[in-house]
């Protein structure tokens, strides 16, 4: 989780801080959304369970050319213990369901806020 505070971060970031920062970034995305997020791109829906961070990254990494979610992609990579590349899929994807990035972000945000409230940071 060392890199989650951004490039200016002086050292390791506590998991609770890292999760709060990810939540705040997702809040920022949802609040600043004017045109359809990522031009209405569709991504695979995921099961919001253990391993969710990698699954979320695997879904979002397939969206290219969308600057609005680049920071989110970087932050999610800090929560995922392995390297994720485009076209990679885990069993956590609901492979028959695609949703808009905006809905994906909204669902992820809701879940992460509850994890934060419950003290589940990893």
């Amino acid at each position: 989780l060392t890199c989650l505070g951004g490039f200016a971060s002086p050292g390791p970031v506590p998991p609770s801080t890292a999760l709060r920062e990810l939540i705040e970034e997702l809040v920022n995305i949802t609040q600043n959304q004017k045109a359809p997020l990522c031009n209405g791109s569709m991504v695979w829906s995921i099961n919001l369970t253990a391993g969710m961070y990698c699954a979320a990254l695997e879904s979002l990494i397939n969206v290219s050319g969308c600057s609005a979610i680049e920071k989110t992609q970087r932050m999610l990579s800090g929560f995922c213990p392995h390297k994720v590349s485009a076209g990679q899929f885990s069993s956590l994807h609901v492979r028959d369901t695609k949703i808009e990035v905006a809905q994906f972000v909204k669902d992820l945000l809701l879940h992460l806020k509850k994890l934060f409230r419950e003290g589940q940071f990893n």
């Epitope: 801080t17 999760l19 809701l110 806020k113 509850k114």
Partner: antibody
Framework: EVQLVESGGGLVQPGGSLRLSCAAS????????IHWVRQAPGKGLEWVAR????????KYDPKFQGRFTISRDNAKNSAYLQMNSLRAEDTAVYYC?????????????WGQGTLVTVSS | DIQMTQSPSSLSASVGDRVTITCRSS???????????LEWYQQKPGKAPKLLIY???NRFSGVPSRFSGSGSGTDFTLTISSLQPEDFATYYC?????????FGGGTKVEIK
């Protein structure tokens, strides 16, 4: 307008069962947590249980676990409290409340309460 | 379970008085996420409780500025700087940091 309305209270004999309902409007229960809090006549408030309607993550005060069951029906935007093996000391006004929708920091809306009387 | 002990259990005061209610938790109520989920609720007879203060010292929207909260660790205080007629009620502290969540026993503020 956000509203919570409890129903299902009434007179029940010791050992009996009752199912309380909490009907929500003005928001989606999946976006927050729903809690049950009770208050015996002339006594203080007592937290009973909480449910996350998005995933059925449930927590109880251990003193109620086993006898009370919290549940939800997202299609009806409602939560429930099933109370079994009722005792005289369960006589109370039962409130449902929701956690606020931003960071879930506090209870911002409560129902009006429903009175449960356990007596023979 | 965390016990929340409120004092006094009741008090008599006059309009304009400064009123202080204390709440002590049996152990720290700092959540693992760094927040302290300590709230104060006001309840009038036959009515549902109403939130006054959350996370120790944050006034809920619409709550008059005469209500303030303070404290840390295990000791918390609700202060009403100048008691108004509508403030005669029962006040409860509440910890939402550790399951099972718990309320204090309440402080009834009565007219002297």
């Amino acid at each position: 307008e956000v509203q919570l309305v409890e129903s299902g209270g009434g007179l029940v004999q010791p050992g009996g069962s009752l199912r309380l309902s909490c009907a929500a409007s003005g928001f989606n229960i999946k976006d927050t947590y729903i809690h049950w809090v009770r208050q015996a006549p002339g006594k203080g408030l007592e937290w009973v249980a909480r449910i996350d309607p998005a995933n059925d993550n449930i927590k109880y005060d251990p003193k109620f676990q086993g006898r009370f069951t919290i549940s939800r029906d997202n299609a009806k935007n409602s939560a429930y409290l099933q109370m079994n093996s009722l005792r005289a000391e369960d006589t109370a006004v039962y409130y449902c409340a929701r956690s606020e929708e931003n960071w879930y920091d506090f209870f911002d809306y409560w129902g009006q309460g429903t009175l449960v009387t356990v007596s023979s | 379970d965390i016990q929340m002990t409120q004092s006094p259990s009741s008090l008599s005061a006059s309009v304009g008085d400064r009123v202080t209610i204390t709440c002590r938790s049996s152990q720290s109520i700092v959540h693992s996420n760094g927040n302290t989920y300590l709230e104060w609720y006001q309840q009038k007879p036959g009515k549902a409780p109403k939130l006054l203060i959350y996370k120790v010292s944050n006034r809920f929207s619409g709550v008059p500025s005469r209500f303030s909260g303070s404290g840390s660790g295990t000791d918390f205080t609700l202060t009403i700087s100048s008691l108004q007629p509508e403030d005669f009620a029962t006040y409860y502290c509440f910890q939402g940091s550790h399951i099972p969540y718990t309320f204090g026993g309440g402080t009834k503020v009565e007219i002297k």
